[in-house]
Interface confidence: low
C-alpha cells in the first residue's frame, strides 16, 4: 500500500488512476468503508465523512482518467487508509498527519529555550531532525530541545520528519528577542556630548514593553538608575530620569539616549534592560563609556582616562607629528615641562586610535590653550 | 504577500528555444498546481500548461504539445516552462499562475515576461 | 475542447452605472466557471469562482450567477478602477478555455 505524509494544516492530494483515459465512476472511501467522495455522472458527490468539508476532487482532471482525493486543513485524525475504487478495482493509500508546533511562543528571549512538539498519529514511529538558521543539526523523537537560544539561531529552522522511508518537510521561523550588541562601548573626550544607541535585533508589529538603564560610575561605591521608559507600540515615553545628569531620550526606536557631556565622575558602565509584554525574562545591553581629559597645569602636562578600558589599551602623549614622548598601559601618561606645539593624547588598541585629545602648549611665558 | 515572477522571455529566432521560469514567494509552492497561460498581442488568454503539486503529473494544450516542457522545483520554489521548436504564433505575454482549488481556477498571477519569435 | 463565448465584445459604461457581462459555455460545465479583470499593460485577476464566490479582497459590487451553459458578472456600481477587459474561463473539462473578452470602456 502507498503511503503518503501529510502536515497538519496543509493540503494533501492522494492519487488515484484509471487506465481508460476518460470520466468513470468512482469513489473513496475510508477504513471504516465511510464514502466520502465519488461522482455520479459529472457531478461530485460527498458521503457522511467527517471529511465532508475539507474533501475535494479536481472534477477537471476526470476526463484524464485521474480521481484524486484532496483533502485541506488536515488534521492529525485523517491519518487513516483511504481506498479508492474504480474500473472493479481497489487503490489503497496510507494517510499518515504530522504535526510540529513551537513550545509556547515562536517569539523567545536570548537565552531561553526552544522546544518543538511533534504531534503523530497512533502506532507511528516517526524520527524527526531540525537545522537551526546556523547550521546547527538536532535530532529527536517526539520532541526536540535547544536551550540557551542565541541571536544566530533567528530564522526559519527545517525539519524533517521521517516514517516509512518517507519524509515531509517543516519550516517554523523563530525570532529570538535580543539587542543586536551584547555589548558596546562609547569613546568620548571629556565636554563631548554621548550618544548611547540600542538597536534591536527584531522587528514586530507592536512592541509593548518598560526599561531602564542602571549606571555603575567607576568612581561611584554603587550603581544607580540614571532613566526609566516606557515602550507601547514602538513609541518611547521617559517615566523617570536622574537629575544628573539629566539624560534625554528619543520618541521612536532604535533607542537612544544622549548624554549631555561626558566628565569624568560618569565614566563606568551601564546596563540597558527591557521587559516586553507578556514575556518573561529581559532582553540586555552592556554599555560602557570611556571619557579622556587633557590637562596642563604649571609644569605638568596630564592625559587621563576613565571607565572601563581592557588592560591591553596604550595611553600615549606625543607632539604633533612627532614620536611619542610617552607612551604607557596606564590610564594616565605626563610629560613635565613639555615644549610648546599641539600635543596629542591618544588612546589606542593595536595601533588603532580610539580616542584622541589635542592641547596647545604655549611657550612657558603664556597660560595653556585647549582647542 | 504572494509574489510570482517570471523571467527568461526574449527576442529568439523561429526554431530557436527558451527557458521562462517563475519564482514563487509568500505561499506554499509545494501545494499548489501551477500553471502557465499566454496572451498574444492584442489577443485573449490561452491555457498553455500545467503541473501537478508534486511535479508528478504535467497536461499540455495541442498546441504547444511535444515542444514545450513544463516542470518545477519545490525545494527553490521555481516553476519553469522550457520552450523548444519555437514558431511565430509563439509570439506572446507568458504568465504564470498558481491553482489552490479545482483544476484551472487561477488565484495569483505573475507579471508576465514577453516572448517574441521573430527573424 | 469546450467554447466560451462572451458577449458584449465591448461595452461603453459611466461611473455608478450598473453592468452585465454574459458568458455561454458550449456545454453543461456545472459551476465550474470564473472571471478574471485584466487591466492594460496587467495580468488577469480572479475575481469570481466557480460561477459565483467571490474571491478574497474583491469589492462586493462583483457578483456572478448562472449554472449550466449560461452565466453572469454584474457589477452593481461602476466605480472608475472597474474600466478594463473582463475574461470568462471554465475549469470543467480538460483544457481549461477562456472567453474573448468584454471590454468595458469609460462612456
Known amino acids: 500500500k502507498k503511503v503518503v505524509l501529510g502536515k497538519k494544516g496543509d493540503t494533501v492530494e492522494l492519487t488515484c488512476t484509471a487506465s481508460q483515459k476518460k470520466s468513470i465512476q468512482f469513489h473513496w472511501k475510508n477504513s471504516n468503508q465511510i464514502k466520502i467522495l465519488g461522482n455520479q455522472g459529472s457531478f461530485l458527490t460527498k458521503g457522511p465523512s467527517k471529511l465532508n468539508d475539507r474533501a475535494d476532487s479536481r472534477r477537471s482532471l476526470w476526463d484524464q482518467g485521474n480521481f484524486p482525493l484532496i483533502i485541506k486543513n488536515l488534521k492529525i485524525e485523517d491519518s487513516d487508509t483511504y481506498i479508492c475504487e474504480v474500473e472493479d478495482q481497489k487503490e489503497e493509500v496510507q494517510l499518515l498527519v504530522f504535526g510540529l508546533t513551537a513550545n509556547s511562543d515562536t517569539h523567545l528571549l536570548q537565552g531561553q529555550s526552544l522546544t518543538l512538539t511533534l504531534e503523530s498519529p497512533p502506532g507511528s514511529s516517526p524520527s524527526v531532525q531540525c537545522r537551526s538558521p546556523r547550521g546547527k543539526n538536532i535530532q529527536g523523537g517526539k520532541t526536540l530541545s535547544v536551550s540557551q537560544l542565541e541571536l544566530q539561531d533567528s530564522g526559519t529552522w527545517t525539519c524533517t520528519v521521517l516514517q516509512n522511508q518517507k519524509k515531509v518537510e517543516f519550516k517554523i521561523d523563530i525570532v529570538v528577542l535580543a539587542f543586536q550588541k551584547a555589548s558596546s562601548i562609547v569613546y568620548k573626550k571629556e565636554g563631548e556630548q554621548v550618544e548611547f544607541s540600542f538597536p534591536l535585533a527584531f522587528t514586530v508589529e507592536k512592541l509593548t514593553g518598560s526599561g531602564e538603564l542602571w549606571w555603575q560610575a567607576e568612581r561611584a561605591s554603587s550603581s544607580k538608575s540614571w532613566i526609566t521608559f516606557d515602550l507601547k507600540n514602538k513609541e518611547v515615553s521617559v517615566k523617570r530620569v536622574t537629575q544628573d545628569p539629566k539624560l534625554q531620550m528619543g520618541k521612536k526606536l532604535p533607542l537612544h539616549l544622549t548624554l549631555p557631556q561626558a566628565l569624568p565622575q560618569y565614566a563606568g558602565s551601564g546596563n540597558l534592560t527591557l521587559a516586553l509584554e507578556a514575556k518573561t525574562g529581559k532582553l540586555h545591553q552592556e554599555v560602557n563609556l570611556v571619557v579622556m581629559r587633557a590637562t596642563q597645569l604649571q609644569k605638568n602636562l596630564t592625559c587621563e582616562v576613565w571607565g572601563p578600558t581592557s588592560p591591553k589599551l596604550m595611553l600615549s602623549l606625543k607632539l604633533e607629528n612627532k614620536e611619542a614622548k610617552v607612551s604607557k598601559r596606564e590610564k594616565a601618561v605626563w610629560v613635565l615641562n613639555p615644549e610648546a606645539g599641539m600635543w596629542q593624547c591618544l588612546l589606542s588598541d593595536s595601533g588603532q586610535v580610539l580616542l584622541e585629545s589635542n592641547i596647545k602648549v604655549l611657550p612657558t611665558w603664556s597660560t595653556p590653550v585647549q582647542p | 504577500e504572494v509574489q510570482l515572477l517570471e523571467s527568461g522571455g526574449g527576442l529568439v529566432q523561429p526554431g530557436g528555444s527558451l527557458r521562462l521560469s517563475c519564482a514563487a514567494s509568500g505561499f506554499t509552492f509545494s501545494s499548489y498546481w501551477m500553471h502557465w497561460v499566454r496572451q498574444a498581442p492584442g489577443k485573449g488568454l490561452e491555457w498553455v500548461a500545467v503541473i501537478s503539486y508534486d511535479g508528478s503529473k504535467e497536461y499540455y494544450a495541442d498546441s504547444v504539445k511535444g515542444r514545450f516542457t513544463i516542470s518545477r522545483d519545490n525545494s527553490k520554489n521555481t516553476l519553469y516552462l522550457q520552450m523548444n521548436s519555437l514558431r511565430a504564433e509563439d509570439t506572446a505575454v507568458y504568465y504564470c499562475?498558481?491553482?489552490?482549488?479545482?483544476?484551472?481556477?487561477?488565484?495569483?498571477w505573475g507579471q508576465g515576461t514577453l516572448v517574441t519569435v521573430s527573424s | 475542447d469546450i467554447q466560451m463565448t462572451q458577449s458584449p465584445s465591448s461595452l461603453s459604461a459611466s461611473v455608478g452605472d450598473r453592468v452585465t457581462i454574459t458568458c455561454q459555455a458550449s456545454q453543461d460545465i456545472s459551476n465550474y466557471l470564473n472571471w478574471y479583470q485584466q487591466k492594460p499593460g496587467k495580468a488577469p485577476k480572479l475575481l469570481i469562482y466557480?460561477?459565483?464566490n467571490l474571491q478574497s479582497g474583491v469589492p462586493s459590487r462583483f457578483s456572478g450567477s448562472g449554472s449550466g451553459t449560461d452565466f453572469t458578472l454584474t457589477i452593481s456600481s461602476l466605480q472608475p478602477e472597474d474600466f478594463a477587459t473582463y475574461y470568462c474561463q471554465q475549469s470543467y473539462n480538460f483544457p481549461a478555455t477562456f472567453g474573448q473578452g468584454t471590454r468595458l470602456e469609460i462612456k
Open positions: 499562475a498558481s491553482d489552490y482549488g479545482d483544476y484551472g481556477t487561477y488565484d495569483y
Open positions: 466557480k460561477a459565483s
